[in-house]
C-alpha cells in the first residue's frame, strides 16, 4: 500500500506542477518570441543599415550626378544596378559622351572628376552601342594613348592591349607623333579609330562601372 | 511575392504554430495531472496497482521539456 | 549574416521546435489514451464512473487538433 | 622659332566680309597644334574665335558659328579667317596663335596683330 | 562657357612694391590657367601656364597660385618694365575665356 497523501498535499502538487508546466510554456512562447521579432527586426534593421549604406554611397556620387537612373537587377528587390541621369547604360558599365572640347589629358582628368575614365572599348558590341550615341562630324577622346611614342598603345584602366581587339581606320595608327587615340567617322569606313595629337582639344567618351547600391 | 516575403510569411505561421502547440501540449499536460490526481482519490487505494501505474507513466512525462 | 538567410535559420528553428512539440503532444495523447484504457481494464468495471469521467476528459482534448 | 604674321586690309565696310591671313613661319601648320584667330576689342576685352586643326578640323566659338570660316592652304603654311556680315561691334586688334603648347595649357606664339576698323 | 572674372580692373603701385592681381572662374578649371602680360601696342606674352608654372624666360619675381574657382598673379618687387595689361585666361575647356584684363600702372 501506497501511503495516502493528504488532499491539500496532492492539490499544493497539482499547484506546483501547473506553474512548472506554464512556466515552462510561457518560456517556450518568450523563446518564440524572441526568434519571431529577430526574424522580424533584425531584417528591418538590415535593410535600414543597408539603406543608410545607399544613402552614403549614394552621397559620394551626388557632387557630380546629382540624379541616378536605376534598374532592377534580376529578381531581387535589393539589386539595383544605376547609372547617372544623362548617361546611357550597356551590360556593366555606363557611358556619357562629353560634348566639351578637351585636350587628352584634360578629357581624361574630367572623366575622372566625374568617378569615370575615358572609354575603353573590349568588344565590336560596346563600340556599335557607343557609335549610336556620336555626332558623325565630330571626333571623340578614347582612353588609348602611346605616352613614349613608340607605337606601345595603352588603356586608361591598364586593359591589356589586344591588336585583336582593335577598330583603326585602315592605315592608322600612321604617325609615331600622335599619341591618342580618337574615334571618328570616315565615309569610305564608317566608325573607327584614328591617332592625334594629345593636345588638340577633342569631345570625348567616359565611361564608368555601373553604381550597384 | 518576393522570396524574403515568403519567408516572413512562413516565419509567422511557424510562429503561431508554436505558440498554439505550446499552450495545447502545456493544457494537456495539466489535464492528464488532474486525471490521475482525480483517478486516484475515487479507487480509494483498492487498485492502488493501477495508480501507481498510471503515475509513473506520468512522471516520466513530466521530465520531458519541450526543447528550448 | 545576410537578410534573408536569417529568415531562413529562423524558419528552420520554429519549424523544428514545431516538429519537436507535434512529437511531444502527440506522444502525450497516445500515452493518456493507453492510460485510459488500462484504467478501464484494471477496474474491471467496478468503478466505473472513474473510468467513465477519465474518457470524457479524453474524449474532450482528442477532438482538439492542433492547427495545421 | 615659329612666327606668325597677320596680314589683311585694315578697313571693312558693315555687312560687308573680313578676310584675313596668318603667314607661319619656323613650323608646319599641318605637323601639330592648333592654329587660332583671337581677337581684341578697342576696351581690352579678349576673345577666341575659332581655330583650324594640323588636322584640318574646326572649331567656331558659338557666338560666332553662322558668320564665321577658318580655312588654310598647306602648300602656302597659310590659314585664314572670314568673318560675314560684319557691324561696328567687330572692329577689333586680330591675333593669330599658335594653340596647344604647354599639353595645352596657354598659349605661347602670337602674332603681332592687325587693327581692322568697321566703319561706314 | 566659363566666365572669367579678373580683380581689380585697374591698379597704381610704385617700382620695389608687390602687388596681387586675381581670376575667379565660374566652375573649377583644375588649374588649367594661363596669366598673361600685355604692353601697349604689341601682343600679350604668355607669364605662367597651369596656374603655377612660369613660362619660359619669365622673371621669377612673377608667382603664380590658386586652385579650383580662385587663382592669383603676385609680383615681387615692382620693376618698370612690369607696367602693363595683365590678363587670365582659363584653358579647362573650349571656349577658352579670357579675364576682362587689369591694367597696373605707376603711381
Known amino acids: 500500500m501506497v501511503p495516502e497523501e493528504e488532499p491539500q498535499d496532492r492539490e499544493k502538487g497539482l499547484w506546483w506542477f501547473q506553474l512548472k508546466v506554464w512556466s515552462m510554456a510561457v518560456v517556450s512562447i518568450l523563446l518564440l518570441s524572441v526568434c519571431f521579432t529577430v526574424s522580424s527586426v533584425v531584417p528591418h534593421n538590415f535593410m535600414y543599415s543597408k539603406t543608410v549604406k545607399r544613402l552614403s554611397k549614394l552621397r559620394e556620387y551626388q557632387q557630380y550626378h546629382p540624379s541616378l537612373t536605376c534598374v532592377m537587377e534580376g529578381k531581387d528587390i535589393e539589386d539595383w544596378s544605376c547609372c547617372p541621369t544623362p548617361w546611357t547604360s550597356f551590360q556593366s558599365s555606363c557611358y556619357f559622351i562629353s560634348t566639351g572640347m578637351q585636350s587628352w589629358t584634360k578629357s581624361q582628368k574630367n572623366c575622372s572628376v566625374m568617378g569615370a575614365d575615358l572609354v575603353v572599348i573590349n568588344t565590336r558590341e560596346e563600340q556599335d552601342f557607343i557609335i549610336q550615341n556620336l555626332k558623325r562630324n565630330s571626333s571623340y577622346f578614347l582612353g588609348l594613348s602611346d605616352p613614349g611614342g613608340r607605337r606601345h598603345w595603352q588603356w586608361v584602366d591598364q586593359t591589356p592591349y589586344n591588336e585583336n581587339v582593335t577598330f583603326w581606320h585602315s592605315g592608322e595608327p600612321n604617325n609615331l607623333d600622335e599619341r591618342c587615340a580618337i574615334i571618328n567617322f570616315r565615309s569610305s569606313e564608317e566608325w573607327g579609330w584614328n591617332d592625334i595629337h594629345c593636345h588638340v582639344p577633342q569631345k570625348s567618351i567616359c565611361k564608368m562601372k555601373k553604381i550597384y547600391i | 511575392l518576393g522570396e524574403p516575403q515568403l519567408c516572413y510569411i512562413l516565419d509567422a505561421i511557424l510562429f503561431l504554430y508554436g505558440i498554439v502547440l505550446t499552450l495545447l501540449y502545456c493544457r494537456l499536460k495539466i489535464q492528464v495531472r488532474k486525471a490521475a490526481i482525480t483517478s486516484y482519490e475515487k479507487s480509494d487505494g483498492v487498485y492502488t496497482g493501477l495508480s501507481t501505474r498510471n503515475q509513473e507513466t506520468y512522471e516520466t512525462l513530466k521530465h520531458e521539456k519541450p526543447p528550448q | 549574416l545576410g537578410e534573408p538567410q536569417l529568415c531562413y535559420i529562423l524558419d528552420a528553428i520554429l519549424f523544428l521546435y514545431g516538429i519537436v512539440l507535434t512529437l511531444l503532444y502527440c506522444r502525450l495523447k497516445i500515452q493518456v489514451r493507453k492510460a485510459a484504457i488500462t484504467s478501464y481494464e484494471k477496474s474491471d468495471g467496478v468503478y466505473t464512473g472513474l473510468s467513465t469521467r477519465n474518457q470524457e476528459t479524453y474524449e474532450t482534448l482528442k477532438h482538439e487538433k492542433p492547427p495545421q | 622659332d615659329v612666327q606668325l604674321q597677320e596680314s589683311g586690309p585694315g578697313l571693312v565696310k558693315p555687312s560687308q566680309s573680313l578676310s584675313l591671313t596668318c603667314s607661319v613661319t619656323?613650323?608646319?601648320?599641318?605637323?601639330?597644334?592648333?592654329w587660332n584667330w583671337i581677337r581684341q576689342f578697342p576696351g581690352n576685352k579678349l576673345e577666341c574665335m575659332g581655330y583650324?586643326?594640323?588636322?584640318?578640323?574646326?572649331y567656331y566659338n558659338p557666338s560666332l558659328k553662322n558668320r564665321i570660316s577658318i580655312t588654310r592652304d598647306t602648300s602656302k603654311n597659310q590659314f585664314f579667317l572670314s568673318l560675314n556680315s560684319v557691324t561696328t561691334e567687330d572692329t577689333a586688334t586680330y591675333f593669330c596663335?599658335?594653340?596647344?603648347?604647354?599639353?595645352?595649357?596657354?598659349?605661347?606664339?602670337w602674332g603681332q596683330g592687325t587693327l581692322v576698323t568697321v566703319s561706314a | 562657357d566659363i566666365q572669367m572674372t579678373q580683380s581689380p580692373a585697374s591698379l597704381s603701385a610704385s617700382v620695389g612694391e608687390t602687388v596681387t592681381i586675381t581670376c575667379r572662374a565660374s566652375?573649377?578649371?583644375?588649374?588649367?590657367l594661363a596669366w598673361y602680360q600685355q604692353k601697349q601696342g604689341k601682343s600679350p606674352q604668355l607669364l605662367v601656364y597651369?596656374?603655377?608654372t612660369l613660362a619660359d624666360g619669365v622673371p621669377s619675381r612673377f608667382s603664380g597660385s590658386g586652385s579650383e574657382t580662385q587663382y592669383s598673379l603676385k609680383i615681387n618687387s615692382l620693376q618698370p618694365e612690369d607696367f602693363g595689361n595683365y590678363f587670365c585666361?582659363?584653358?579647362?575647356?573650349?571656349?577658352?575665356?579670357f579675364g576682362g584684363g587689369t591694367k597696373l600702372e605707376i603711381k
Open positions: 596663335v599658335r594653340g596647344g603648347d604647354y599639353d595645352d595649357g596657354g598659349f605661347a606664339y
Open positions: 619656323g613650323y608646319s601648320i599641318t605637323s601639330g597644334y592648333y
Open positions: 583650324i586643326s594640323y588636322d584640318g578640323s574646326n
Open positions: 566652375g573649377n578649371i583644375h588649374n588649367y
Open positions: 597651369n596656374a603655377k
Open positions: 585666361q582659363h584653358f579647362w575647356i573650349i571656349p577658352y575665356t
